[in-house]
């Protein structure tokens, strides 16, 4: 892979010196480094009207390196790019730009959304939920005996949480009234609902669920702030009820 010099041979600057600073193999007073020691990258830095050669162990931000047989050279990425694979393909954009297919954009194209952590344009992800689980046994105040009219609940899982612009999740709990033949509670029988039905409450902000309306079946679009307020109100209600030592099945 030896370099075969073309018609335009590069002429050395008249003031070429061998006593060079940090990493330079050859240098001149006027242009700085002209060539580098092995494994170092040669980069031209513009200082005013002058271009100064510098030798570095790796290319600086906004440059990419090419290891030619006779020289390791840094080449500038496009102006809006911080890290690039080559002139055509950016891999990390400068602040304020979003990366999409190797290009840096002010805004993400239609159908994509900006990920403000990675600063990339990503596909919009919509909520996905599982099928409904079977209805729970008919209960009243947490008991399965000693009443005629109670409520039953069914749940479904969130399979895919939505991204910022994705469709919100529909309700994951549904409660309805139920009627059973009254059955006397046996002595000491509390008849509480099975523990396996208890679901861990999602962490704050973990699931983007829409709160159902009074029918408990339709989802409504709402802002994160509204959702946060409702969750706080719900927590307070639950705490109040716990103080009154009444266990009720609620709609999430």
């Amino acid at each position: 892979q030896n370099a075969s010099r073309g018609r335009r041979q590069r002429r050395m600057h008249p003031n070429v010196s061998q006593g060079c600073q940090g990493g330079c193999a050859t240098c001149s007073d006027y242009n700085g480094c002209l060539s580098c020691k092995p494994r170092l990258f040669f980069v031209l830095e513009r200082i005013g009207m002058k271009q100064i050669g510098v030798c570095l162990s790796s290319c600086p931000s906004g440059y990419y390196g090419t290891r030619y047989p006779d020289i390791n050279k840094c080449t500038k990425c496009k102006a809006d790019c911080d890290t690039c694979f080559n002139k055509n393909f950016c891999t990390k954009c400068k602040s304020g730009f979003y990366l999409h297919l190797g290009k840096c954009l002010d805004n993400c194209p239609e159908g994509l959304e900006a990920n403000n952590h990675t600063m990339e344009c990503v596909n919009i992800v919509h909520c996905e939920v599982s099928e409904w689980n079977p209805w729970s046994p008919c209960t009243k105040k947490g008991k399965t005996c000693g009443f005629k009219r109670g409520t039953e609940t069914r749940v479904r899982e969130i399979m895919q949480h939505p991204s910022a612009k994705g469709n919100l999740c529909p309700p994951t709990n549904e409660t309805r009234k139920c009627t059973v033949q009254r059955k006397k509670c046996q002595k000491g029988e509390r008849g509480k609902k099975g523990r396996e039905r208890k679901r861990k409450k999602p962490n704050k902000g973990e699931s983007k669920e829409a709160i159902p309306d009074s029918k408990g079946l339709e989802s409504s679009k709402e802002t994160p702030e509204q959702r946060e307020n409702k969750q706080q109100q719900k927590k307070r209600k639950v705490q109040d009820k716990q103080q009154k030592s009444v266990s009720v099945s609620t709609v999430h």
């Epitope: 075969s4 073309g6 041979q9 090419t66 290891r67």
Partner: antibody, heavy 116, light 107 residues
Framework: EVQLVESGGGLVQPGRSLKLSCAAS????????MAWVRQAPKKGLEWVAT????????YFGDSVRGRFTVSRDNTKSTLYLQMDSLRSEDTATYYC?????????WGQGVMVTVSS | DIQMTQSPASLSASLGETVSIECLVS??????FVWYQQKSGKSPQLLIY???RLQDGVPSRFSGSGSGTRFSLRISGMQPEDEAEYFC?????????FGAGTKLELK
């Protein structure tokens, strides 16, 4: 739209010469290192030569060094490959490509057959 | 020169099947790695650069992974238009070297 169009291929006898040309359009030719990559019939890809953006340096694969020369005319956005002392093993489709670490743009290729 | 060992040499897959092609490199090249697709009678086209980044227009069923000396190309759900030869290339240093290629056919 980027276009690279090769020409100058054909049938040539061993030991003879051939010059390939590649006309480029749709991108800033003078910004890019340009290369020739070849592919023998039913075989893989082999890098032949690269000339840097300003034409001042060129690099060659072991199998062609000393026999092939590469040049460019940035005013005409054209790349050339001068092939001398051709051998039967030089028989291949020759592709003109923009070489910037990866080979980003490719021409349609031109067939060179070296046979007596 | 950096050696590229690509496997398998050929592969046939059914429609919708997931396929993987691997490339082993003789020295650590970080992620300076590229995949090309060459359809029959056509010139190669850049598919993936920097080991895992898709070129514009490449369907999302294609994905690249790996770093250092081991790289792979995955097609999640083979389509008729994916029938082609695939080549890997190291872009770490001169001379640029290619894998021998993998011919992917539709069963």
């Amino acid at each position: 739209e980027v276009q690279l169009v090769e020409s100058g291929g054909g049938l040539v006898q061993p030991g003879r010469s051939l010059k390939l040309s590649c006309a480029a359009s749709g991108f800033t030719f003078s910004d890019y290192d340009m290369a020739w990559v070849r592919q023998a019939p039913k075989k893989g890809l082999e890098w032949v030569a690269t000339i840097i953006y300003d034409g001042s340096r060129a690099y060659f694969g072991d199998s062609v060094r000393g026999r092939f020369t590469v040049s460019r005319d940035n005013t005409k956005s054209t790349l050339y490959l001068q092939m001398d002392s051709l051998r039967s093993e030089d028989t291949a489709t020759y592709y003109c490509t923009a070489h910037d670490r990866s080979f980003d743009y490719w021409g349609q290729g031109v067939m060179v057959t070296v046979s007596s | 020169d950096i050696q590229m060992t690509q496997s398998p040499a050929s592969l046939s897959a059914s429609l919708g099947e997931t396929v993987s092609i691997e490339c082993l490199v003789s020295e650590d090249i970080s992620n300076d790695f590229v995949w090309y697709q060459q359809k029959s009678g056509k010139s190669p086209q850049l598919l993936i650069y920097a080991a895992s980044r898709l070129q514009d227009g490449v369907p999302s069923r294609f994905s690249g992974s790996g770093s250092g000396t081991r790289f792979s190309l995955r097609i999640s759900g083979m389509q008729p238009e994916d029938e082609a030869e695939y080549f890997c290339q190291q872009s770490y240093k001169y001379p640029p070297t290619f894998g021998a290629g993998t011919k992917l056919e539709l069963k």
